[in-house]
């Protein structure tokens, strides 16, 4: 029996192929077999089908990196990693995607979902679009909507200072942040750590964070698969 999606363009299509276990999968940008990308798929959270593009969990990976590293991606996709801005830009150019952020700390958990999420191309300096919040973590990403990505060696924020340099991370900084998920792991100094302002504030570094995306119409696709 042939697969529904021989060259799945994201984790939702992998899931619709019958793959329901979270782990590493190969996806193909635009369904093009020459554009293969290994990703970690979360097949359990809120119905699954998510491409995980950021994970913080133990501080073993260095996230204070330059523009080139954030464009390309780094880390171990089973552990701490960043998928890469070039990849995010290509994936979100395939259609309408939603963003989910999962946060955990000492047995507490919170999440945020944004039903419209995209990352622009390199020319736009990977401009962020994030709209339509729901969840329990608080709408901290709202502040970063419309911003370009910033690293210590490419300062695109609107602050006098270099936000990435000041807060030892990288993000779609404005002046400077309400979200700093690429901050210094375990650093509880003001604004330096893994922060989600409307959940734990700026003086507490969150233990576990994941950012992930899937098509906004995933629920419809999932329903179609079940009926089939």
């Amino acid at each position: 029996i042939g697969l529904l999606y021989p060259f799945p363009r994201d984790c939702s299509q992998a899931m619709l192929n019958g793959d329901t276990t979270s782990g590493l999968y190969t996806i193909y940008i635009n369904g093009d077999k020459t554009q293969a990308l290994e990703v970690y798929c979360d097949m359990t959270s809120d119905g699954g089908g998510w491409i995980v593009f950021l994970r913080r969990k133990n501080g073993r990976e260095d996230f204070y990196r330059n523009w080139k590293a954030y464009a390309a991606g780094f880390g171990d996709r089973r552990e701490e990693f960043w998928l890469g801005l070039d990849n995010l830009s290509k994936i979100t150019a395939q259609g309408q995607y939603e963003l989910r952020v999962d946060l955990q700390d000492h047995g507490e958990s919170a999440y945020a979902v944004y039903d419209r999420f995209s990352v622009g191309d390199a020319k736009s300096r990977y401009k962020l679009k994030v709209e339509g919040y729901s969840g329990t973590a608080g709408d901290s990403m709202n502040y970063h909507n419309g911003r370009s990505f910033s690293t210590y060696d490419k300062d695109t924020d609107s602050a006098i200072t270099n936000c990435a340099l000041s807060y030892k991370g990288a993000f779609w900084y404005k002046n400077c942040h309400r979200v700093n998920l690429m901050g210094r792991y375990g650093d509880n100094n003001h604004s330096q750590g893994v922060n989600w302002f409307h959940w734990k504030g700026h003086e507490y570094s969150i233990q576990f964070a994941e950012m992930k995306l899937r098509p906004s119409n995933f629920r419809n696709l999932e329903g179609r698969r079940k009926r089939a």
């Epitope: 709202n142 502040y143 909507n145 602050a159 400077c176 003001h190 604004s191």
Partner: antibody
Framework: QVQLVESGGGLVQPGRSLRLSCAAS????????MHWVRQAPGKGLEWVSG????????YYADSVKGRFTISRDNAKNSLYLQMNSLRAEDTALYYC?????????????WGQGTMVTVSS | DIQMTQSPSSLSASVGDRVTITCRAS??????LNWYQQKPGKAPKLLIY???NLETGVPSRFSGSGSGTDFTLTISSLQPEDFATYYC?????????FGQGTKVDIK
């Protein structure tokens, strides 16, 4: 052009209610959080309440919590402030203001204000 | 709540003077600081947002600086239309709070 016009102010007795309105034009109303800021005669500015673009999140100053309710009708490009159990200290010029980008942000557009006087 | 303290509360200056107004936050607020100008009988007008960004249409003689807890609004060469009251505001957290204002009048 971008404009905010407040209405609904007036003289009201303590303990009574009043509803302020703010009509917006010249921008995509539901893309922006909106706020009410007041200024007592001869005094400084005090933030009163705010609401997200969708209306899903609302925020209040402690001084008005439980008495005032902010709401919006995006179909009508309108913002409202329902003020109950009014007190003399609520006497002020009430301004409607647009958030620059996010819910907690600078206020880049202000209305001309509507005066609320609470007195017996 | 975050307290915002402006100084001075009033100042007298002449046309052409360089004027500096400071604003101090009671806690660290990164760069979430805005400045407004208000003339008698008028609504406030945004001058500077995010500590240092000049709002569109505002003359370049106005500038803002600072980060963390201490911020400054500078008017490089005071003009007749600049005599007004100036307010700082933190937008770091709710409730957003304003300074008590600085009145700039003619010497």
């Amino acid at each position: 052009q971008v404009q905010l016009v407040e209405s609904g102010g007036g003289l009201v007795q303590p303990g009574r209610s009043l509803r302020l309105s703010c009509a917006a034009s010249g921008f995509t109303f539901d893309d922006y959080a909106m706020h009410w800021v007041r200024q007592a005669p001869g005094k400084g500015l005090e933030w009163v309440s705010g609401i997200s673009g969708s209306g899903g999140s609302t925020y209040y100053a402690d001084s008005v919590k439980g008495r005032f309710t902010i709401s919006r009708d995006n179909a009508k490009n309108s913002l409202y402030l329902q003020m109950n159990s009014l007190r003399a200290e609520d006497t002020a010029l009430y301004y409607c203001a647009k958030s620059y980008q996010s819910d907690e942000d600078a206020f880049d557009i202000w209305g001309q204000g509507t005066m609320v006087t609470v007195s017996s | 709540d975050i307290q915002m303290t402006q100084s001075p509360s009033s100042l007298s200056a002449s046309v052409g003077d360089r004027v500096t107004i400071t604003c101090r936050a009671s806690q660290y607020i990164q760069g979430f600081l805005n400045w407004y100008q208000q003339k008698p009988g008028k609504a406030p007008k945004l001058l500077i947002y995010d500590a240092s960004n000049l709002e569109t249409g505002v003359p370049s003689r106005f500038s803002g600086s600072g980060s963390g807890t201490d911020f400054t609004l500078t008017i490089s060469s005071l003009q007749p239309e600049d005599f007004a009251t100036y307010y700082c505001q933190q937008s770091y957290s709710t409730p957003q709070t304003f300074g008590q204002g600085t009145k700039v009048d003619i010497k």
